[in-house]
């Protein structure tokens, strides 16, 4: 049925009184300025809100900050600006919130020009108290927490020094100078690039990649001629300048940089770039930019070593280095990713993969939608999703696509239905099966969020006019009910709910404007009384993910296994609850050739599932280097797709070949490696 507030589908009775009793307003008594909001910890209910206001004076800009804290999911806020001595906080550094439930917060303050160093405010008790610490350097970046130990902090200074603290920012030590980029790896390891001569920019392509595993006591140079590096899953990547020219190649390590292999990816020139789109412990999605200012490139997917790559998607939209791409991991269903391609006619189209980049297709047209003006055939068209690129182009798209791991199968996004993305005002669409089928959910642009692991979806209109109505659905977006949360409409700027979609609270943020003043205001609504009871076994039904044809014996098989989930029935109005854990049951599938990718030196001819040897390796770019040495590679031409769990069935056995590889990269052969100690 078409989206709307149909009387027939009013699931929740007498909700107005229940919600009215659970609606809390807070007016922030400062001028509008800008506002940033951070959640501190998981299930703590603690929110920090930082408002900043710039007053441009004749000579300089005077800044004023206010800090507010809530410990009840935003129902009430307390002004705690005095805890940070009424200091102006630098919003470009944001609020550095510690990992997991550490309760740690670091705020970076603005200090006057002549000071020796910067200033931070530190809290380790969920922002109940703050300690002021003056730094021996001026920070260039936000403080970075070690994922393993939240007491270990890392920062780069404006002078390119690498600073480390082992006691949550109390004491700092400069462990290296001339540092361009630094990142935490696993086990409190730090990776960083250094320049020898001029600067980061001047030495680009001549940087060295270093590693310290003991917070700066000792170092190991693990790469030279480095352009940049990145971490993804268990992979460490470095782009390395070639000897002969200005091109560079990707090298990959799975042992923290002790040994490297050259990735079987095209080299790129000065104006091009590589980008890790997504990575996990199994594999990597890598974007390789096309030559020239095309705005697109190619997506490649890796094998389990990060070495052999299969072409996944051509003409992948990615504007410039650090620019915009629509690549989105649909976290509510395994193997699903959505992105955009730039077609030959320069229109932008959405593509989806259900098998981790193996195949890409257009999104199925929603049953309750008509094809728009971009469609040549009014009966045949697709759904196209607005994501980062549309937002960057200032289209009327307030939010990127949304999915949550604990709201199985649900994807919500703005989109249009036609042959390509339309610049017309978009509508909101929902899929309840991870992107296979879609339904128009709401007319026009909205802010939306998922609560209670999918038990409730809430939305507010994105409008230039003030609003006072919130919409909610308890059946995965099929039917909507509306609640007037205030008599006096506000200019809404968004919705805020605790990350992880387990909360029952939603905050509507916005501002009120009167003749002389404008003030920030938030309305927090607790939906706990709408879902009066806890869900029981009878409230769930069994669902097979990735099902497309029940008559196919292997229906639902993706990457070698199928998964059945217990999903909340659409008719059940009950609480999944904070402790809800997705119940799923995997079953292994039989192997087919689809479960294998072609190994080094082999390829799949068009429309063929068999891997054939590249004819005498002629005309193929096979510069390939394993562990920095020339050596033999033995292969039978097939390699199981990373993360594939199939068993039995097809086992592609053929004689094992020895492929002589040529190692044309002089990137760090083992004898060049050196270690240093502080």
């Amino acid at each position: 049925s078409a989206p709307g507030e149909d009387e027939e589908c009013g699931r929740v009775r007498d909700f107005v009184a229940k919600l009215a009793n659970n609606t809390h307003q807070h007016v922030f008594d400062d001028l509008r300025g800008s506002v940033s909001l951070s959640w501190v910890g998981d299930s703590t209910g603690v929110i920090l809100v930082l408002t900043t206001f710039h007053v441009p004076l004749v000579i300089m800009t005077f800044g004023q900050s206010k800090l507010y804290r809530s410990e009840d999911y935003g129902k009430n806020f307390k002004d705690i600006t005095d805890l940070i001595n009424n200091t102006f906080i630098r919003t470009e550094f944001g609020m550095a919130i510690g990992p997991e439930n550490s309760g740690k917060v670091v705020l970076t303050a603005e200090v006057s020009g002549g000071s020796r160093g910067g200033r931070i405010f530190r809290s380790s008790d969920f922002a109940k108290n703050f300690v002021q610490t003056d730094l021996p350097f001026h920070p260039l970046t936000q403080m970075m927490y070690s994922p393993q130990n939240s007491d270990y902090l890392l920062a780069l200074s404006t002078e390119n020094g690498l600073w480390v603290s082992k006691n949550f920012g109390g004491k700092w030590e400069e462990i290296h100078k001339a540092v361009c980029l630094a990142k935490w790896g696993s086990d409190n390891t730090i990776f960083f690039t250094t320049y020898a001569n001029g600067s980061c920019k001047a030495d680009l392509g001549a940087l060295e990649l270093w590693r310290t595993s003991d917070l700066g006591k000792s170092f190991k140079t693990i790469g030279v001629k480095i352009y940049s590096f990145g971490l993804g899953g268990r992979f460490l990547f470095a782009s390395v300048m070639a000897d002969k020219d200005t091109t560079r190649r990707i090298h990959v390590s799975t042992d923290q940089g002790d040994t490297w292999s050259m990735a079987q990816l095209p080299s790129v020139g000065q104006e091009q770039f590589y980008s890790i789109l997504a990575a996990n412990d199994d594999m990597v999605f890598m974007h390789v930019d096309e030559p020239g200012d095309t705005g697109f490139g190619t997506i490649f997917t890796s094998d389990d070593r990060g070495i052999v790559y299969s072409k996944s998607l051509d003409r992948h939209l990615y504007t410039t280095t650090g620019g915009e791409t629509d690549f989105t991991n649909v976290t509510s269903l395994r193997g699903v990713y959505i992105t955009s391609v730039l077609s030959e006619d320069n229109s932008i189209q959405t593509m989806i993969t259900f098998d981790q980049g193996g195949r890409w297709t257009h999104l199925r047209k929603p049953e309750n939608s008509e094809c728009d003006a971009t469609a040549k055939n009014k009966n045949e068209c697709s759904l196209h999703i607005h994501a980062s690129y549309s937002i960057s182009q200032k289209l009327n798209v307030p939010m990127a696509p949304l999915s949550e791991p604990n709201a199985v199968g649900i994807v919500i996004a703005h989109g249009s239905v036609g042959d390509a993305i339309s610049v017309m005002v978009p509508d909101v669409y929902i899929s309840d099966d991870g992107g296979y089928s879609w339904t128009k959910m709401l007319e026009g642009p909205h802010y939306y969020t998922i609560l209670d692991s999918g038990g409730i979806i809430v939305a507010i209109e994105h409008s230039s006019r003030p609003i006072n109505v919130i919409k909610f659905s308890t059946d995965e977006g099929q039917c909507w009910q509306t609640y007037t949360f205030t008599r006096d409409p506000i200019y809404a700027t968004g919705l805020a709910s605790e990350p992880g979609a387990r909360s029952m609270n939603i905050s509507i943020w916005g501002f009120t404007e009167s003749f002389l003043t404008s003030q920030w205001v938030s309305y927090t609504i607790d939906f706990k009384d709408i879902l009066e009871r806890n869900c029981e076994e009878k409230d769930y039904t069994i669902w097979l993910a990735h099902s497309t044809d029940p008559e196919d014996y292997e229906d639902g098989c993706i990457l070698g296994y199928k998964e059945q989930f217990l999903r909340l029935r659409k008719s059940s109005v009950c609480q999944n609850g904070r402790d809800y854990v997705v119940t799923k049951q995997p079953s292994i599938c039989l192997c087919s050739l689809e479960d294998f990718l072609c190994d080094f030196g082999y390829y799949r001819p068009e429309n063929d599932s068999k891997c054939v040897e590249q004819p005498e390796l002629k005309g193929h770019d096979l510069e390939f280097c394993l562990y920095g040495r020339e050596e033999h590679l033995t292969t039978n031409g097939y390699r199981k797709i990373p993360g594939d769990k199939c068993q039995g069935g097809v086992n592609p056995v053929r004689e094992v070949k020895d492929l002589k590889k040529k190692c044309t990269s002089n990137f760090l052969s083992p004898e060049k490696q050196n270690s240093k100690s502080n």
């Epitope: 589908c9 199968g409 099966d433 059946d475 069994i542 097979l544 990735h546 029940p550 059945q564 659409k570």
Partner: antibody, heavy 124, light 106 residues
Framework: QVQLVQSGAEVKKPGSSVKVSCKAS????????ISWVRQAPGQGLEWMGG????????NYAQKFQGRVTITADESTSTAYMELSSLRSEDTAVYYC?????????????????WGQGTTVTVSS | DIQMTQSPSTLSASVGDRVTITCRAS??????LAWYQQKPGKAPKLLIY???SLESGVPSRFSGSGSGTEFTLTISSLQPDDFATYYC????????FGGGTKVEIK
Amino acid sequence: QVQLVQSGAEVKKPGSSVKVSCKASGGTFRNYAISWVRQAPGQGLEWMGGIIPIGGWANYAQKFQGRVTITADESTSTAYMELSSLRSEDTAVYYCARQGRKTGYYYYYGMDVWGQGTTVTVSS
Amino acid sequence: DIQMTQSPSTLSASVGDRVTITCRASQSISSWLAWYQQKPGKAPKLLIYKASSLESGVPSRFSGSGSGTEFTLTISSLQPDDFATYYCQQADGHITFGGGTKVEIK
């Protein structure tokens, strides 16, 4: 064409158990839920429960919880329904039926294939 | 569990008549409703699934409509073969059937 063939009629004493089988042929048994529905003489249809052969996930109507056990054997494409502590009110025709499926949901699309029914008579 | 109330319980009609049977759910079930036809001594036969989708092989004189809590099965022109008992069944909760509607010759 999919067919469901059920075991023959049974006469049982009160307090005993009955186990009815339902063998599928001509389709992918494992990918569909099998429901069990009964019909007492002159009465309407009553759903007892169902099972999904993959993983053996069974669920039961509240009324029969604890008294009915539904199982499936993928290797023989057979589903079973066992009803214990029989009483005279359990005298009925017992049907197995395949739940039609158009999406990943097993129970939402109606029962498109039915067995011929098994008459169970409970009498002392 | 969700209760299904079917009406009427008996309906007398003649060949060629337009017949409408109603089914009401105790709570909203979206479109998850099926209709069956059963003849004496036979297993039920699926006519309609998802409230309005016609099962393959079923004559087009049968149609279903409704969503939420109110549903109808319509036989546009009753044929001799259509005299039987009709059941609705909801699928968005533990499955429950309506009490049945017997369509008999007037």
